[in-house]
């Protein structure tokens, strides 16, 4: 398993991740957004709701 060198993103990338933490993947030369729960997208820009099915009448 290859080890990945990571560090915090530079100040230059402030605001890059809209709803998440910015991580600098050094060996890949990339900034990566670790999204908060409920958000997705390269920059955690999309909010998604997990829809739970209501209990069926039979169950009630």
């Amino acid at each position: 398993v290859a080890q990945v060198s990571i560090t915090k993103c530079s100040s230059d990338m402030n605001g890059y991740c809209l709803h998440g933490q910015c991580i600098y993947l050094v060996d890949m030369s990339q900034n990566y957004c670790r999204c908060e729960v409920g958000y997705t997208g390269v920059r955690c820009e999309h909010f998604f709701l997990t829809v739970h099915q209501p209990l069926s009448k039979e169950y009630v």
């Epitope: 560090t7 230059d12 605001g15 030369s29 990339q30 920059r43 820009e45």
Partner: antibody, heavy 116, light 106 residues
Framework: QDQLVQSGAEVKKPGASVKVSCKAS????????IQWVRQAPGQGLEWMGR????????KYREKFEGRVTITADTSTNTAYMELSSLRSEDTAVYYC?????????WGQGTLVTVSS | DIQMTQSPSSLSASVGDRVTITCKAS??????IAWYQQKPGQAPRLLIQ???TLQPGVPSRFSGSGSGTDYTFTISSLQPEDIATYYC????????FGGGTKVEIK
């Protein structure tokens, strides 16, 4: 394959404005920041500013504040750099540069010549 | 804006020589420095980012080191194809290039 394709060479008179375009293909500019860098003939590299196309936020180098405007059209996946009140010292090759999802991926450059 | 002072502005060395270029930042840039090679008529080519991380395809004779405000770029054994101008770039806060170092063969 990811590409940044810039508009062609321009010749402008002193006092005029120039608008250079930078069209991205193979990736979405909303996932990146687009930086602009210039290089005068025989001179070094000079960072001018950048835009966050997703939010429209810009940052400029102090010396260019008020004279440069960087914009982005996410519908056409294109970034623009407009420089006004041109003078002879603005003769340079202007580069757009992607950062964010990949560290510093450069366009081919656009030569802007300012001459009376 | 952060200032980057690069030295020397030019140097002449023999094939096989060790070449060292330095960049000093006006404040701590937390290792967020990159090094570029530029040949006449070409766009700059990224060699190293985050102080010492070599880009894919870049020969191992190129290396970088440093921390805080002081950074060094080294060519361990100069080759004819290394004749170019080299630039440092800080990307900790906005971006600033060093003035460049023109490397020539003696």
């Amino acid at each position: 394959q990811d590409q940044l394709v810039q508009s062609g060479a321009e010749v402008k008179k002193p006092g005029a404005s120039v608008k250079v375009s930078c069209k991205a293909s193979g990736f979405n500019i909303k996932d990146t920041y687009i930086q602009w860098v210039r290089q005068a003939p025989g001179q070094g590299l000079e960072w001018m500013g950048r835009i966050d196309p997703l939010r429209g936020n810009t940052k400029y180098r102090e010396k260019f504040e008020g004279r440069v405007t960087i914009t982005a059209d996410t519908s056409t996946n294109t970034a623009y750099m407009e420089l006004s009140s041109l003078r002879s010292e603005d003769t340079a090759v202007y580069y757009c540069v992607r950062s964010g999802t990949l560290f510093d991926f450069w366009g081919q450059g656009t030569l802007v010549t300012v001459s009376s | 804006d952060i200032q980057m002072t690069q030295s020397p502005s030019s140097l002449s060395a023999s094939v096989g020589d060790r070449v060292t270029i330095t960049c000093k930042a006006s404040q701590d840039i937390h290792k967020y420095i990159a090094w570029y090679q530029q040949k006449p008529g070409q766009a700059p080519r990224l060699l190293i980012q985050y102080t010492s991380t070599l880009q894919p395809g870049v020969p191992s004779r190129f290396s970088g080191s440093g921390s805080g405000t002081d950074y060094t770029f080294t060519i361990s054994s100069l080759q004819p194809e290394d004749i170019a101008t080299y630039y440092c770039l800080q990307y900790d806060n906005r971006r600033t290039f060093g003035g460049g170092t023109k490397v020539e063969i003696k």
